[in-house]
Interface confidence: low
């Protein structure tokens, strides 16, 4: 089904306007900001979510060290251009004709330029490192329990296939979740790691995108896991292209 039929809402995206206008009176939902129809049985793409949002805003020794090419989303919110499938267009521009290239999660991967800037293809983000710091607890979480709970969360709440959760690292109070998904690995119907990471990020911030569900209540063996800081690193299949000035800054 595409949406909750009883009251015509979108369980996986509250930033929608829904009406039962589909075949046989089936509920159909369209994303705010773009008017694009969304499939409410799965996660909505990050591009459409960002567009909707705009219409309505460290490394310990055993933990993964992000590579020199890892990107962090420092540019914040912007009103993106999405393609007919809801993916980010490779080139994004603002109202003042400043343009830049983005990766598949919408993060800038080049210096900013003008309308002459070319972005030949949408480069896929194949590795996402979610770096969390949890609030102090009586003791450290059991690593195996934490690993199991986070894998369950991504499988059940975000519908991400377990094979894409590559690892869960833990060194109190830092947790790192590695998501990996190459272009060749992602089959039709698979949730994109970028979309899952974005839903998780919004959940962690107490800004759940799910309709009617309570906020994220993360518990490990009954003990609340409260996150106080989140950093997300994005690694692309092709390294980003920034000027030396940025790389040495």
């Amino acid at each position: 089904h595409t949406a909750a039929q009883d009251n015509c809402t979108c369980p996986t995206n509250k930033m929608t306007v829904c009406s039962p206008d589909g075949p046989g009176g089936r509920c159909q939902c369209r994303a705010l900001g773009s008017g694009m129809a969304v499939d409410c049985s799965t996660l909505t793409s990050k591009c459409l979510l960002l567009k909707a949002r705009m219409s309505a805003p460290k490394n310990a020794r055993t933990l993964v060290r992000p590579s020199e090419h890892a990107l962090v989303d420092n540019d914040g919110l912007y009103d993106p251009d999405c393609d007919p499938e809801g993916r980010f267009k490779a080139r994004q521009c603002n109202q003042t004709s400043v343009c830049w290239c983005v990766n598949s999660v919408g993060v800038r991967r080049t210096d900013k330029g003008d309308l002459s800037l070319r972005c030949d293809e949408l480069v896929r983000t194949h590795h996402i490192l979610i770096d969390l710091r949890h609030r102090p607890t009586a003791g450290a979480f059991n690593h195996s329990d934490l690993d199991a709970e986070l894998r369950r969360l991504f499988r059940e709440r975000y519908r991400l296939h377990p094979k894409f959760v590559a690892a869960v690292h833990y060194e109190q109070p830092t947790i790192q979740i590695e998501l990996r998904q190459n272009t060749s690995q992602k089959a039709a119907g698979d949730v994109d790691i970028g979309d899952a990471a974005y839903y998780f990020e919004r959940d962690i911030k107490g800004e759940s995108l799910f309709q009617g569900r309570g906020g994220l209540d993360l518990r490990v063996r009954g003990e609340p896991l409260q996150v106080e800081r989140t950093l997300i690193y994005y690694l692309d299949e092709i390294p980003p292209k920034f000027s030396m000035k940025r790389l040495t800054a």
């Epitope: 009251n7 009406s19 206008d21 900001g33 567009k51 009103d79």
Partner: antibody, heavy 117, light 107 residues
Framework: EVQLVQSGAEVKKPGASVKVSCKAS????????INWVRQAPGQGLEWMGN????????NYNQKFKDRVTMTRDTSTSTVYMELSSLRSEDTAVYYC??????????WGQGTLVTVSS | EIVLTQSPATLSLSPGERATLSCRAS??????IHWYQQKPGQAPRLLIE???ESISGIPARFSGSGSGTDFTLTISSLEPEDFAVYYC?????????FGGGTKVEIK
Amino acid sequence: EVQLVQSGAEVKKPGASVKVSCKASGYTFTSYWINWVRQAPGQGLEWMGNIYPSNSYTNYNQKFKDRVTMTRDTSTSTVYMELSSLRSEDTAVYYCSSYRSDGFAYWGQGTLVTVSS
Amino acid sequence: EIVLTQSPATLSLSPGERATLSCRASQNIGTSIHWYQQKPGQAPRLLIEFASESISGIPARFSGSGSGTDFTLTISSLEPEDFAVYYCQQSNSWPFTFGGGTKVEIK
């Protein structure tokens, strides 16, 4: 053929309430939102809110939230819009309309409500 | 709420001429805009939905374009029955709102 037939014209005094009906036919009544839109004489269109007959789920325009109530009777495929505490500026033609996507494709003939002392 | 501003308020044209009506939204609404025609004493009639999607039964001379904040309804060649008031409406967010209307009158 989809049809929305509304009740007749009403004349009300300020402070009174009015209840306008909209009877639907030609489609599955519970499967489409019914919207209410009003139009004051010589003025434009103003969306008041809508109701989903399947479960009476409603969305109201904040402007009317305290004064408007939308209900439905599935046995007669009829939706009602009640507006209370009427004032002279509520004098308007009140239309019911049903969705085709988010555009309002089907409209009732309109009901003129006159508020006058 | 999202404010829709239509221009011009009145458009004076002759039959056979091309009519271009504008609707500007106070914020980005993607393609969540719909166009209606209303004649005196009648209910509005849906012409175009989601900026450019045609409605069955509506003549092909009516077309829509635009996205974001600027939208256009075009009547390629005015017929006598096209002289009426035209409204745009957004469904991007509650409350749904309408533009103030553009009256297309015979010159």
